[in-house]
Structures are given as C-alpha cells and as structure tokens.
C-alpha cells in the first residue's frame, strides 16, 4: 500500500463507477430533490462532483457515506441528464446518466353524477375529470370515504366513468373522486357530492 497511489495502481474492482440515484424520480417544477452519489468501496477518501450535462453543480467529499446534493427543479431542462464523478487522487470514474421525469400536478377534479331512478334501484353514473396535470391520470371513486372502484387510468383528457346500482338507500351518501398521476404522494380530491336519502324531488341528479 503506497502513501501516494495513482490511478494505474488501482484495480478496476477496487474503484468501480459510482452510483447516482434519487428517492424521487418523478418531480414537479419547483420541487426540491436530493441526489445521492455513492461508491461500493467504503474505505476510499472519495471526492464526488455532480454535473448536469456539462455544468458543474457541486463537489463534496466522503468516506463510507454517500454525497448528498440538494437541488431545485425549476425548469424543464433541469430534468437532466445528471452524472456523478467519483475521484480518488488522479483516478476518476463517472456514473451512468440519471434523469428526472417532470410531471405537472393534477388539479382538483370535478365530480359529476347522473342518476336513473327506478322504484327499487338507483343506477348511478359517476364522472370525474381533472382538466390539468400530466397524463396518464388515475381516478378512483369513493363512497362515504371508502373506495368503490379500482384505479381507472385515463390517457386522454376525458372523464373517468364508473357505474353502480344501489337499492334506494335509507340515508344520505357522499361521493367524491381522487385524481392522481405519476407524482408520488400527490393526489387531489373533488368536492364531495351528497346524494339525498330518498327519491322524488329531493333527488336533483335523478332522471326518471
């Protein structure tokens, strides 16, 4: 083991390429993200540098722990690609490219209800549409805070539709829908729509 060790003296398996990753791969504009640059060799004194295309964004050193770079994604061109350079003295290796997917968040969806009332049943059609947000959008319908539909994926700007038939209920029921796209932990809900307990004039959505 030399006091001064150059790149030629380092075996490839001792100094492989670093790994660049982020817990958040899908982001919206204005979001803060953390990028982690790490190396398999936990004994080396490594200097990590982060680049976006050819722009140098920052440098940190670390031994046995990843370098953490905190960024804000404000523009489309900031999606990437990003690269991390790991350097030990004169020896350096680059990570694979990493790019974020920028997604526009969904806006609160609008829930429309159409009801066909019969003597014994109500045939309910629920329509849910979010007019903004990157596609595809997954819609889920809820009755009294309980999901009553699977996630319905829409790849176009058309409402999701869900049909159900119910015996004429004896009490009010509240419906709402959720819109969600690829942004993690980011879902929006429609305003609730309450269905009255009995038919007749008190059913404003009913078609007789």
């Amino acid at each position: 083991r030399k006091a001064v060790l150059d790149c030629e003296a380092m075996k490839t398996n001792e100094f492989p390429s670093p790994c660049l990753d982020s817990k958040t791969k899908v982001v919206m504009k204005g979001q803060n993200v953390s990028m982690f640059c790490s190396h398999k060799n936990k004994s080396l004194q490594i200097t990590y540098s982060l680049f976006r295309r050819k722009t140098h964004l920052g440098t940190q050193d670390g031994k046995g722990e990843p370098a953490i770079f905190n960024l804000s994604i404000t523009e489309a061109h900031e999606s990437g690609p990003y690269k991390c350079k790991a350097q030990v003295t004169s020896c350096s290796k680059y990570s694979r490219d990493f790019s974020f997917t920028i997604v526009d968040p969904v806006t609160s969806p609008v829930l429309n209800i159409m009801v066909i009332q019969t003597e014994t049943d109500r045939h309910i059609t629920l329509h849910c549409l979010s007019v903004n947000g990157s596609l595809p959008i997954n819609y889920t319908f809820f009755e009294n805070h309980v999901a009553i539909s699977p996630a319905i994926s829409k790849y176009d700007r058309e409402p999701a539709e869900f049909n159900l038939t119910k015996k004429n209920p004896g009490e009010e029921e509240e419906y709402r829908c959720e819109a969600k796209n690829r942004l993690p932990n980011y879902a929006t809900y429609s305003h609730p729509v309450t269905m009255p307990s009995t038919g007749g004039d008190s059913c404003p959505f009913c078609l007789k």
Partner: antibody
Framework: EVQLVESGGGLVQPGGSLRLSCAAS????????MIWVRQAPGKCLEWIGI???????YFANWAKGRFTISRDNSKNTVYLQMNSLRAEDTAVYYC???????????WGQGTLVTVSS | DIQMTQSPSSLSASVGDRVTITCQAS??????LSWYQQKPGKAPKLLIY???TLASGVPSRFSGSGSGTDFTLTISSLQPEDFATYYC?????????????FGCGTKVTVL
C-alpha cells in the same frame, strides 16, 4: 523520490504574520487533500486544518479567523498563512497529504515557527 | 466537534511486555481512526489505519481494534525501537470544521 518540504518558518514577533509553504517533489499534489499539523515543544500533535482537492478549507475551531490554507497547483505547493501570531503558536509545523484512504501517511520534516519579542 | 481522549498519558514498560493504549472519541467516528508513532525530532509515522488495518512495512506486533468511540492500540511484545510517543487521530467520514483531532499522546518509556 517522493518527498515533502515545509519552509517559511523562523522567528516572528507577536502580532506578526508568516506564510509557510509545503512543496512536493516526485508526485503531484493537485488531487490530494492536504492537512497542516503543528506540535509545540514537548506538547501534543494538533490538527490545524485541511484543504480539499477542490480547494474548500476546514479548520479546527481555535484556528478559524487567524489561519488560512491555500494551494497553487501550478507550483505543486500548499500554503499556511498565519496572522496575529502569539507566543503559544510557537511550534513545528508539518504538512501531509491524505492517502487514498483519507489518512496522512507521507510527512515532511516540519518547519519551526518561533513567536517571541 | 470531535475530541480524542488518549490514555494513559505515559507508561513505563520493559522489552517483551504487552502494551495497550486506548483512545476515546467524543462522538462516534465509525472506524475512521489511525495510530501514529513519533520519535523525538521526527515526523509521525503511520502504524494503523481504519482502526485495525496495519500500514505497509509495520511489524505485526502492532495491532488495532475498536469502532464507534472506543479504540485500542496493542503492542504484543515491546521491542527496543518501540519506545516512542503514540498518537491516535480520529476523523469524521466527511471533511468539516473541527472534524479531525489527535489524541494528546502516550509516551512509552523504559521501565
């Protein structure tokens, strides 16, 4: 031959300044983290600070404000600038590069700084 | 901030003795600790790095152990050339202000 040579030490009056140099021969300092360490006569080794390969510097709390570290890669030299010197700064000053594992292994012979009126 | 407390500050021993020196870090530093030997008028010499790895050219009678906050340097059978002062050096994994510190040394003298 790989070696380090510290220079610039000598006698200086209290309140004065001094710049120490650490020059490498036989290898390039450019990509190495460099530390400065001192040892007062008969006392412990004391870590002063470090300059990283990317020119960021870090110091022991007692050295902040009075000491600065810089590097000139074209001259293969690292510097320790010491200001407002006091009698208690009298010591042998060493520089050392971190090896690839982050430990100082190669040391110079040191340069003696004496602060006295 | 990191502080390294080394003990004992001095000890007397005879050739062939087993000698143990301890170093305690004020906070956990993993295994980022090295041991140095220094003789009068000379620069320090690296003995052990990463708490337990023997540096190149260092006799096998020297060994290191420990991690976190408590570390030990052991000389299994003291030789005449081992009478010197020994220092530990602790550091965090990432460079930082006050992130590196020496212990205050253990002077090993002839009994």
């Amino acid at each position: 031959e790989v070696q380090l040579v510290e220079s610039g030490g000598g006698l200086v009056q209290p309140g004065g300044s001094l710049r120490l140099s650490c020059a490498a021969s036989g290898f390039s300092l450019n990509n190495y983290f460099m530390i400065w360490v001192r040892q007062a006569p008969g006392k412990c080794l004391e870590w002063i600070g470090i300059i990283t390969s990317y020119h960021t510097t870090y110091f022991a709390n007692w050295a902040k404000g009075r000491f600065t570290i810089s590097r000139d890669n074209s001259k293969n030299t690292v510097y320790l600038q010491m200001n407002s010197l006091r009698a208690e700064d009298t010591a042998v000053y060493y520089c050392a590069p971190y090896d690839i594992y982050g430990y100082p292994t190669l040391w110079g012979q040191g340069t003696l700084v004496t602060v006295s009126s | 901030d990191i502080q390294m407390t080394q003990s004992p500050s001095s000890l007397s021993a005879s050739v062939g003795d087993r000698v143990t020196i301890t170093c305690q870090a004020s906070q956990s530093i993993g295994a980022y600790l090295s041991w140095y030997q220094q003789k009068p008028g000379k620069a320090p010499k690296l003995l052990i790095y990463e708490a337990s790895t023997l540096a190149s050219g260092v006799p096998s009678r020297f060994s290191g152990s420990g991690s976190g906050t408590d570390f030990t340097l052991t000389i299994s059978s003291l030789q005449p050339e081992d009478f010197a002062t020994y220092y530990c050096l602790g550091a965090y994994g990432r460079s930082s202000d006050d992130g590196t510190a020496f212990g205050c040394g253990t002077k090993v003298t002839v009994l």
